[in-house]
């Protein structure tokens, strides 16, 4: 049940305007934030219960402003945060400690970025510093879709300092996109 | 433990604004987003808005897009509401309460509430 | 917008009762329905989550269930402590909206 929500608002360099799908899944592991946490509560349906078409992702809209160092966008950007319950709950209650166990097999459907579209933004800078124009990356769409367990494995790479250090009685929760790594994915438009 | 501590109770004039605060302690702040709803004597619960502290994001019901201003400070782990103009109408308790998007997608711990009381 | 309608404003049944409080969606939620707790002036507190997720804590009297617009908060065994009123709340698309509540009290 962990796994499900993916969120991208990092504002990225892209290649032209418009709408274009995902990158495969293996690229996706630096781009999305993988929100991995379980919190220890039992799953909340039979494993294998439903069909998965029973299951469908959250698309959250939120508005928010562009930021890069002191420049801040003109106007505000909308955005989408994938996040959802994509399939059964795919571990396994851990009695000691009320954790949680990866079901060590079987595909995994999790809620992430479908579509993105390039928006460019103007950003304006205080002191005098001339706007600057952007093009950033936009998640437009989600879907629920089937990851294997070699793409779970390899996500647990990139879980950074805070795996390090994981809630008790809680699987470890990636941390966001800092504002640099967003900062260094702002690119000139020009 | 997780905690969500807010402002203590306000009794404001007519056409002014207040500023109720919401410290998040016990868990990572920008990893879970905030929601703020409001509940007038009585009644039942109003969704406000949600703020996702990581990048400043937010949404808001139409019904308070000219009335409140959701902010969060990452630094203090502390989100913000500023409403505005006020009203008698706005009198209530607001309750700010945290989302886990990734897992449980409900609001699963609230803050005590603040009353906002409005009269001249 | 989604309105999430709970038909019964209050609700009045003896101690060891079994209760059903039920709670409707304008359109489809896709069980992302939630159930909350509020005794007389106290805070709020998650029940029930994704239709039928105990929070931990929650005793086992209570239960969840439903599909598609339809959901319903079963106690199976009431309990002076669930003297409380109960919202639900669509958690699928902001805005999120809450039902009017449910008051439930002792015969």
């Known amino acids: 049940q962990g796994w499900q929500a993916f969120k991208n608002d990092a504002t990225e360099i892209i290649p032209e305007l418009g709408e274009y799908p995902e990158p495969p899944p293996e690229l996706e592991n630096n781009k999305t934030m993988n929100r991995a946490e379980n919190g220890g509560r039992p799953p909340h349906h039979p494993f294998e219960t439903k069909d998965v078409s029973e299951y469908s992702c959250r698309e959250l809209h939120f508005t928010r402003y562009v930021t890069d160092g002191p420049c801040r966008s003109a106007k505000p950007v909308t955005e989408l945060v994938c996040s959802g319950q994509c399939g059964p709950a795919r571990l396994l209650p851990n009695a000691i400690g009320r954790g949680k166990w990866w079901r060590p097999s079987g595909p995994d459907f999790r809620c992430i970025p479908d579509r993105y579209r390039a928006q460019r933004v103007q950003l304006l800078c205080p002191g005098g510093e001339a706007p600057r124009a952007r093009k950033v990356r936009l998640v437009a769409s989600c879907k629920c879709k089937r990851l294997t367990r070699f793409h779970n494995q390899s996500e647990l790479k990139d879980f950074g300092t805070e795996a390090a250090r994981p809630q008790k009685g809680r699987k470890p929760r990636p941390r966001a996109r800092s504002a640099k790594a967003n900062q260094a994915e702002l690119e000139n438009a020009y | 433990q997780v905690q969500l501590q807010q402002s203590g109770a306000e009794l404001v004039r007519p056409g002014t604004s207040v500023k109720v605060s919401c410290k998040a302690s016990?868990?990572?702040?920008?990893?879970?987003?905030i929601e703020w709803v409001k509940q007038r004597p009585g009644q039942g619960l109003e969704w406000i808005g949600v703020?996702?502290?990581?990048?400043?994001?937010?949404n808001y019901n139409e019904r308070f897009k000219d009335k409140a201003a959701l902010t969060a400070d990452t630094s203090s782990s502390t989100a913000y509401m500023q409403l505005s103009s006020l009203t008698s109408d706005d009198s209530a308790v607001y309750f700010c309460?945290?989302?886990?998007?990734?897992?449980?997608?409900?609001?699963?711990?609230w803050g005590q509430g603040t009353s906002v009381t409005v009269s001249s | 917008d989604i309105q999430m309608t709970q038909t019964t404003s209050s609700l009045s049944a003896s101690l060891g009762d079994r209760v059903t409080i039920r709670c409707r969606a304008s359109?489809?939620?896709?069980?992302?329905l939630n159930w909350y707790q509020q005794k007389p002036d106290g805070p709020v507190k998650l029940l029930i989550y994704y239709t039928s997720t105990l929070t931990s804590g929650v005793p086992s009297r209570f239960s969840g269930s439903g599909s598609g617009t339809d959901y319903s908060l079963t106690i199976s065994n009431l309990d002076q402590e669930d003297i409380a009123t109960y919202f639900c709340?669509?958690?699928?698309?902001?805005?999120?909206?809450f039902g009017s509540g449910t008051k439930l009290e002792i015969k």
């Open positions: 709340q669509q958690g699928k698309t902001f805005p999120f909206t």
């Open positions: 703020i996702n502290p990581e990048n400043g994001g937010t």
């Open positions: 016990g868990y990572v702040f920008i990893n879970y987003f």
């Open positions: 359109q489809d939620i896709s069980n992302y």
């Open positions: 309460a945290r989302e886990d998007y990734g897992d449980v997608y409900a609001m699963d711990y």
